[in-house]
Interface confidence: medium
């Protein structure tokens, strides 16, 4: 009864420049097989709770699972399978016609960088000429999912997209984020944040790709009409996006209340929890509705800002109205006003 929870289960993620994300392939008794996303009675477009695949990520020495669902581009190998029963079970699988199979993709968090990255393998820089145009977001090592420098591939050509700040491209960014299955556009990232600056430890081969693109039509509705090829620029910005599907999201909890549905709001920064400081941009119940939902409680009953008489009170600050828009938290080392939230308790 093989499942991805079993100690001897073998899997790999292919068709990306990282062992921690890509198309899921599993080793069964007769070799490697690509897993179709229609397996286990799912529809080919269905996204799953990724933490169910935590064992797969763990075996690959990657971090926590970030997304589990259809892979952006299906490259069908010789053998693809559809499996039946429960999600993650491989004891009852059948071979699938390649043209009927949409591959299942898994993205795990990149592990902490301990050695310089290897050079980019050929599939990324030279996709099959027959492959349809596709996009890729390249995050910095250990960076966020759905955040990074945009690379566009057409046939055997791939590269970054030249971007000028004055370009009015909001429609295009929404289209790109959506095409990457990363939700909607939130903001442009400076290149350092997107991880494009050359790391001194990086090998010379990991240089910008030899092709560059320019935005041709910011209202395009299919990838092949969005960009045109240009001579690579020595300087200038490249397009780097943060989409609403970025991971990891800010996690919250309520502490010090009489139940899990009330308390002072804390958020997680790495492995540390700290108080969330009040922010004038969050003076509406929207932020707290989101916090209540994350605790699996009902809607907000009340929230109150606690007095910050202590100049040394510290915490973390999110400048956006909703925590789900926060891809970074700032430390506040003084006058942090904590917020006490009471949500409706579904199990009073």
């Amino acid at each position: 009864r093989l499942s991805w929870y079993d100690p001897d289960f073998q899997a790999r993620l292919t068709r990306s420049n990282s062992k921690c994300q890509g198309q899921l392939e599993v080793y069964l008794k007769d070799g490697w097989h690509m897993v179709c996303s229609q397996s286990w009675g799912r529809s080919s477009k269905q996204w799953e709770d990724p933490s169910q695949a935590s064992k797969v990520c763990q075996r690959l020495n990657c971090g926590v699972p970030l997304s589990l669902g259809p892979f952006l581009v299906t490259y069908t190998p010789q053998s693809s399978i559809i499996c039946y029963g429960q999600l993650g079970s491989f004891s009852n699988c059948s071979h699938s016609r390649n043209d009927m199979c949409h591959s299942l993709g898994l993205t795990c968090l990149e592990p902490q960088k301990t050695t310089p990255p290897t050079t980019r393998p050929p599939p990324t820089t030279t996709p099959e000429p027959t492959a349809p145009p596709r996009l890729q977001l390249v995050a910095q090592s250990g960076g966020q999912h759905c955040a990074g420098v945009v690379e566009f591939y057409s046939g055997s050509l791939g590269g970054t997209i030249s971007y000028e700040a004055q370009d009015k491209t909001q429609d295009l960014e929404n289209f790109l984020c959506n095409n990457l299955q990363c939700g909607s556009f939130l903001k442009h990232l400076p290149e350092t944040e997107a991880g494009r600056a050359q790391d001194p430890g990086e090998p010379r081969e990991h240089q910008p790709l030899p092709i560059q693109w320019k935005i041709q039509n910011s209202s395009c509705t299919s990838l092949e009409h969005c960009f045109r090829k240009i001579k690579p620029q020595k300087s200038g910005r490249v397009l780097a996006l943060l989409c609403s599907g970025f991971q990891p999201k800010v996690q919250s909890r309520l502490v010090g209340g009489s139940s899990i549905c009330e308390g002072t709001v804390e958020v997680r920064q790495g492995a540390q929890w700290a108080a969330l400081c009040d922010s004038s941009s969050a003076r509406s119940s929207l932020r707290w509705e989101e916090v209540c939902r994350e605790q699996q409680c009902g809607s907000v009953n009340s929230y109150r800002v606690l007095d910050a008489g202590d100049p040394t009170s510290r915490g973390l600050f999110c400048p956006h109205q909703k925590l789900s828009q926060c891809h970074e938290l700032w430390e506040r080392n003084s006058y942090c006003k904590k917020v006490f939230v009471t949500c409706q308790d579904p199990n009073p």
Epitope: E48, D49, S51, Q52, S54, K55, C57, Q58, N61, C62, G63, V64, L87, L109, E110, P111, Q112, G142, P248, Q251, R253, R268, G270, A271, W273
Partner: nanobody
Framework: EVQVVESGGGLVQAGGSLRLSCAAS????????MGWYRQAPGKEREVVAA???????YYEDSVMGRFTISRDNAKGTLYLQMNGLKPEDTAVYYC??????????????WGQGTLVTVSS
């Protein structure tokens, strides 16, 4: 650091019920997914049931419909309700937690196990 401790094992007649509990302590908010595994004498450890953060569950075929896994995220407690027990369910039952450590890497935490004996 997360520690897990199982309880609730014991001797029961075939057809009877038991409820296993697993209490996690330490940084319980770093727990990603939790599961119950078992190891019968002379056999390999196998997964019985698992539950993700989002509440999605996985059951080994032979326990489907008889066992129910549940989890209280706030308390960091995992449960396994076992009904219709059979002699072949006799094993040491282990609690397992995947926890998030530095850099987002996962590490596994195991309990010492609790013995379940089903007599015919």
């Amino acid at each position: 650091e997360v520690q897990v401790v199982e309880s609730g094992g014991g001797l029961v007649q075939a057809g009877g019920s038991l409820r296993l509990s697993c209490a996690a302590s330490g940084s319980i908010f770093s727990i990603n997914a939790m599961g119950w595994y078992r190891q019968a004498p002379g056999k390999e450890r196998e997964v019985v049931a698992a539950i993700s953060n989002g509440g999605n569950t996985y059951y080994e075929d032979s326990v489907m419909g008889r066992f129910t896994i549940s989890r209280d995220n706030a308390k960091g407690t995992l449960y396994l309700q076992m009904n219709g027990l059979k002699p072949e369910d006799t094993a040491v039952y282990y609690c397992n937690a995947d926890t998030v450590v530095g850099g987002g890497l996962l590490t596994e935490v195991w309990g010492q196990g609790t013995l379940v004996t089903v007599s015919s």
